[in-house]
Interface confidence: low
């Protein structure tokens, strides 16, 4: 059976594999998917080795008709890189000569200067170039190699391993050699991957439940460090809680030198986050730390600085923490706006079974603000998910010179962030170089500024204007508001109408549905506009809900069903890839997030119209 | 991936001025920060001025005579050398968040 990185070369023109004869000898044959001679995958960025022999694909020379066959593989040998050219077009790095069928007299794969269709390939049983299987760097644990990644092949014992392997050992642990000669270099590492014993990679809290893996003995950038976190189904280490920090100087008490952590500020407009998206809730930095010098924008944890934190450039080496199994946020679930009848006082705002109001014109320092959102039966408002912040920004009248209060604050414990209403940090979105947390003047309290109402913490002796929030009642007669400019059974947002086509169908009935409808698929001009999507779809019980984008016209460039620009995207990790096809929006915990589907798979959808007696804006020139 | 190609570099007598150009191609969307670095024959790769957002950083070296700017819609960034001295020879390197994305570098020599 082929392994998720192994692949077939498939000519189309001839329907017709690559078969690895022997080392001298790559012809073709017919495609045989159990045959081991057929069967390549991406060892390094540029080689391709025959998973038969164990050999890399390469050429005697950079010349127009020569032979491909295999060679020992070698990393810094210019006759064996390869890379995709456009479409499927594979060829020698650098040149414009390419992996081609030969012809009716040579049976062997050439090299050579012609694109035309025997110059074209596929993995076989797929639309995909063969870079689509890429090759992924394997970082090694333990071991004498400072994590350095595996080499594929290495050669043990004077055989050669295409995979890690635990030849040598008695214990099962699997390994990999981190040169392609072990048996010279001797520098090894353990495999990230699930085996008898791995778990004892990790420390378990008992408290919590969450592991936690030290790789202090390493030298990765922090970029690298969170890709082995992430192959071993894990993340770099975020800590919300001062348990958890306490529990972690304890395990990194005996150790020096720094260790990566998941806390960066890589985001553009935002600021300090954590990689696994925790909420940046409880601060514990180094004295003089964060340091606003630009590049520093990754974290370390400093076990001989009683493990406080600074900020680092991104491309130092260092050992790195990480994290898995239960997060240690409280499980907390947020209602969906669709799910909860809301029914607000008079010039207050429903979302999603509370009610907001904006004080904007009576500033206040942030005590008196909340003493006056509790007489009003509420409090400083908390904020829990991207939609409610986005709900706040884009229908509340928020606007981007304000600066108002939120119900954050770390007056309770310094340095430790909670809601003033009582529910717990799920997620904070701070602004760039926030929280500060200047010490000369405490900033103990929290303000929502700037155009897209990111968080920055402040004195709490600042007069400003601040926003109440209040569980909505739902006692009285039940309001049926009726969405004005929109039919019955849809709903209104800005400008739009939008309805749940609730009939399982591909992308194409989708589409003729909504057209049945004097509608189309779902556009999504803005993040506004997806909150809302994600807000109307995110917690219902199927997976998927169609929307108007896919690559059908053109393969690898996506389209809306309408003619309208793309200017938005919201894509899930890993998409769109370069597999072909039609768009749908995720639910549950990826809810909103864009997918690539097949676009005969079956889903429900969404469908979108003008509003009746809505003015049409003029569209944008380009 | 990102991938960026510096230009401009070249041989100035000690006072002159030349312009450094940084073009980014790629997944440029993916650009926070951009920064200019330098090395010198056997000293360590130094960080000369980076921008993020509207904020700009120098190396106290060169505050006041270097300036740098981008020009999103050309995805390019520059870096303005003026009253250059003989110190500021190295190779100059342009760089796309903060470490992840490097150029190849180009060359400045100032003669004195």
């Known amino acids: 059976l082929l392994d998720t990185r192994q692949f077939l070369i498939y000519n189309e023109d001839h329907k017709r594999c690559v078969d690895a004869v022997s080392p001298s000898a790559v012809q073709t044959a017919a495609c045989n998917q159990d045959a081991e001679s057929q069967k390549f995958r991406w060892v390094s960025e540029s080689q391709i080795m025959s998973v038969a022999f164990k050999l890399c694909l390469g050429v005697p020379s950079k010349t127009d008709w020569v032979a491909i066959t295999l060679y020992a593989c070698d990393s810094k040998s210019e006759f064996q890189k390869w890379e995709c050219k456009n479409d499927t077009l594979l060829g020698i790095k650098g040149e414009d000569l390419f992996f081609n069928y030969g012809n009716r007299q040579e049976k062997n794969i050439m090299l050579y200067k012609g694109s035309g269709l025997w110059s074209r390939w596929k993995i076989y049983g797929t639309t995909d170039n063969l870079c689509s299987r890429g090759y992924e760097a394997m970082y090694t644990l333990l071991g004498n190699a400072n994590g350095a990644t595996c080499a594929f092949p290495f050669k043990f014992e004077n055989k050669w391993y295409a995979d890690c392997t635990s030849a040598g050992r008695s214990d099962g642990w699997l390994w990999c050699g981190t040169t392609t000669d072990y048996d010279t270099d001797k520098l090894f590492g353990y495999c990230p991957l699930k085996f008898e014993g791995s778990e004892s990679l990790w420390n378990k809290d008992p408290l919590t439940s969450v592991s936690y893996q030290i790789n202090s003995k390493s030298a990765l950038t922090w970029h690298q460090a969170r890709k082995s976190c992430q192959q071993q189904n894990a993340e770099l280490l975020s800590i919300t809680e001062i348990h958890e920090q306490t529990y972690l100087t304890g395990l990194t008490s005996s150790l020096t030198s720094g260790l990566w952590i998941g806390l960066n500020s890589l985001s553009f407009n935002s600021g300090w986050q954590w990689s696994d998206r925790s909420p940046f809730r409880y601060l514990n930095w180094l004295p003089g730390s964060p340091s606003a010098e630009p590049g520093k924008s990754c974290v370390s944890l400093n076990p001989g600085k009683n493990a406080k934190w600074e900020n680092l450039e991104c491309v130092q080496k260092l050992g790195y923490i990480c994290k898995k199994g239960n997060t240690t946020l409280n499980s907390f679930v947020i209602p969906s706006e669709s799910d909860v009848p809301t029914h607000c006082p008079s010039q207050w705002w429903p979302y999603a079974g509370h009610c907001y109001k904006i004080h904007r014109d009576e500033k206040k320092i942030q005590r008196d603000a909340l003493t006056t959102c509790r007489k009003e039966g509420g409090d400083l408002t908390s904020i829990h998910t991207i939609e409610e912040l986005d709900f706040i920004i884009s229908q509340l009248g928020y606007e981007p010179n304000d600066e108002l209060w939120i119900g954050l604050n770390d007056i309770k414990i310094q340095m430790y962030f909670e809601w003033s209403d009582g529910t717990p940090v799920t997620f904070t979105k701070w602004l760039r170089g926030e929280p500060s947390h200047e010490n000369n003047r405490q900033e103990d309290c929290v303000v929502m500024k700037g155009k897209d109402g990111y968080w920055a913490d402040r004195g709490c002796e600042w007069p400003l204007g601040y926003i109440c929030k209040m569980k909505s009642r739902s006692q009285g007669p039940e309001i049926v508001e009726v969405e004005k400019g929109c039919r019955k059974g849809w709903k209104k947002h800005h400008f739009y109408c939008y309805m749940i086509g609730h009939t399982l169908s591909t992308f194409a009935e989708a589409n003729q549905t909504c057209n049945n409808e004097n509608a189309y698929l779902t556009t999504i001009e803005d993040r506004y506009e997806q909150a809302f999507l994600t807000s109307f779809v995110g917690l219902r019980p199927e997976k998927y809900f169609w929307t108007g984008l896919s690559d059908i016209q053109t393969k690898g460039t996506f389209q809306w069903t309408i003619e309208e620009e793309v200017r938005f995207t919201h894509w899930n990790s890993d998409m769109p890839g370069r597999k072909p096809g039609c768009v749908a929006m995720r639910t549950g915990i990826a809810g909103g997030l864009w997918d690539v589907l097949k676009c005969d798979e079956k889903a429900k959808f969404v469908c979108k119209h003008w509003a009746e007696g809505v003015t049409h804006p003029p569209k944008p020139t380009t | 991936q990102v991938q960026l190609q510096e230009s401009g570099g070249g041989l100035v007598q000690a006072g002159g001025s030349l312009r450094l150009s940084c073009a980014a191609s790629?997944?440029?969307?993916?650009?926070?920060?951009m920064g200019w670095y330098r090395q010198a024959p056997g000293k360590q790769r130094e960080l000369v001025a980076g921008i993020t957002g509207g904020n700009t950083h120098y190396a106290d070296s060169v505050k006041g005579r270097f300036t740098i700017s981008r020009d999103n819609a050309k995805n390019t960034m520059y870096l303005q050398m003026n009253s250059l001295k003989p110190e500021d020879t190295a190779v100059y390197y342009c760089?796309?968040?903060?470490?992840?994305?490097w150029g190849q570098g180009t060359q400045v020599t100032v003669s004195s």
């Open positions: 790629g997944s440029t969307f993916s650009i926070n920060n």
């Open positions: 760089n796309a968040n903060w470490g992840a994305y």
